[in-house]
């Protein structure tokens, strides 16, 4: 049976916690990704940004989980208007920012 949205979001949050906690070397070798607007469509926008990082096993599970939240197909190189124009940040900072935002969404009951 499908996982309730609240459970899925909780699991995504916990996965992001694990990523930030287990950082030994720079996450994804210090790869940079496009910063996103966190106010709307955050799951698809986050996936569109992170999908461009390849060969980084640490975020593969996060990419799969975000895919489950995003209603449309996302492929590398694709980017919506949710990108913050010409601003790139390290994957580690992207994950930290995303984590705090998702915790706030969970508090607000915005599970999908």
């Amino acid at each position: 049976s499908p996982v309730p949205p609240s459970t899925a979001l909780k699991e995504l949050i916990e996965e992001l916690v694990n990523i930030t906690q287990n950082q030994k070397a720079p996450l994804c070798n210090g790869s940079m990704v496009w910063s996103i607007n966190l106010t709307a469509g955050v799951y698809c926008a986050a996936l569109e940004s992170l999908i461009n990082v390849s060969g980084c096993s640490a975020i593969e599970k996060t990419q799969r989980m975000l895919n489950g939240f995003c209603p449309h197909k996302v492929s590398a190189g694709q980017f919506s208007s949710l990108r913050v124009r010409d601003t790139k940040i390290e994957v580690a900072q992207f994950v930290k920012d995303l984590l705090v935002h998702l915790k706030k969404l969970f508090r607000e009951g915005q599970f999908n």
């Epitope: 949050i13 916990e14 916690v17 906690q21 706030k104 508090r107 607000e108 009951g109």
Partner: antibody
Framework: QMQLVESGGGVVQPGRSLTLSCAAS????????MHWVRQAPGKGLEWVGV????????HYADSVKGRFTITRDNSKNTLNLQMNSLRAEDTAVYYC???????????????WGQGTMVTVSS | SYVLTQPPSVSVAPGETATITCGGN??????VHWYQQKPGQAPVLVIY???DRPSRIPERFSGSNIGNTATLTIEDVEAGDEADYYC???????????FGGGTKLTVL
């Protein structure tokens, strides 16, 4: 200015009851979750309970569950804490505090009252 | 129920940096708030939602929350920062708000 003022504290015998009140002013009371927090002499902060903005939900700490009841009157901007079957370990300063209300009550307490002392002693 | 662990005391010289920790199982998955309480006064919110700062709180105060530890950092400590500091989270599993035991910050 925004203010919370507690009242109703005092000395009460074990097993008896007491009701504390918290009067809110300077903000839209009905849009905030309201909490009670207590602090025994020389000890840390202990959360007592919360009532949602519309009064539809309450949650309590295990230590007071079944003995304490939180109510509110949004038309009068007041919060109440009815304390029954009081014990010596309930002796503390009692604070009311507000927190913006979301789906879950995980918000920080951005406004506190000055506190009212409750002493449970025979 | 959920438990938050703080060191009972932290001492620091004026001008130095104070670090106060708050430990909890996977606390990084929760939003952490920090309060300052001076003797005889009500607590005051100094950090909310892990790292946000109310407008009236100096930039010297900052917060972080990773893994099993949340941290309150006070840079360039002043005598006026001497107080008790408490961390706080909402425990979704028990529908209760939880405070840490508190840390007494002493400015030497």
């Amino acid at each position: 200015q925004m203010q919370l003022v507690e009242s109703g504290g005092g000395v009460v015998q074990p097993g008896r009851s007491l009701t504390l009140s918290c009067a809110a002013s300077g903000f839209e009371f009905r849009t905030y979750g309201m909490h009670w927090v207590r602090q025994a002499p020389g000890k840390g902060l202990e959360w007592v309970g919360v009532i949602w903005d519309d009064g539809s939900n309450t949650h309590y700490a295990d230590s007071v569950k079944g003995r304490f009841t939180i109510t509110r009157d949004n038309s009068k901007n007041t919060l109440n804490l009815q304390m029954n079957s009081l014990r010596a370990e309930d002796t503390a300063v009692y604070y009311c505090a507000r927190a913006p209300q979301w789906y879950l009550t995980a918000e920080a307490f951005d406004l506190w009252g000055q506190g009212t002392m409750v002493t449970v002693s025979s | 129920s959920y438990v938050l662990t703080q060191p009972p005391s932290v001492s620091v010289a004026p001008g130095e940096t104070a670090t106060i920790t708050c430990g909890g199982n996977l606390i990084g998955a929760k939003l952490v708030h920090w309060y300052q309480q001076k003797p005889g006064q009500a607590p005051v919110l100094v950090i909310y939602d892990d790292s946000d700062r109310p407008s009236r709180i100096p930039e010297r105060f900052s917060g972080s929350n990773i893994g099993n530890t949340a941290t309150l950092t006070i840079e360039d400590v002043e005598a006026g920062d001497e107080a008790d500091y408490y961390c706080q989270v909402w425990d979704y599993s028990s529908d209760t708000m939880v405070f840490g035991g508190g840390t007494k910050l002493t400015v030497l």
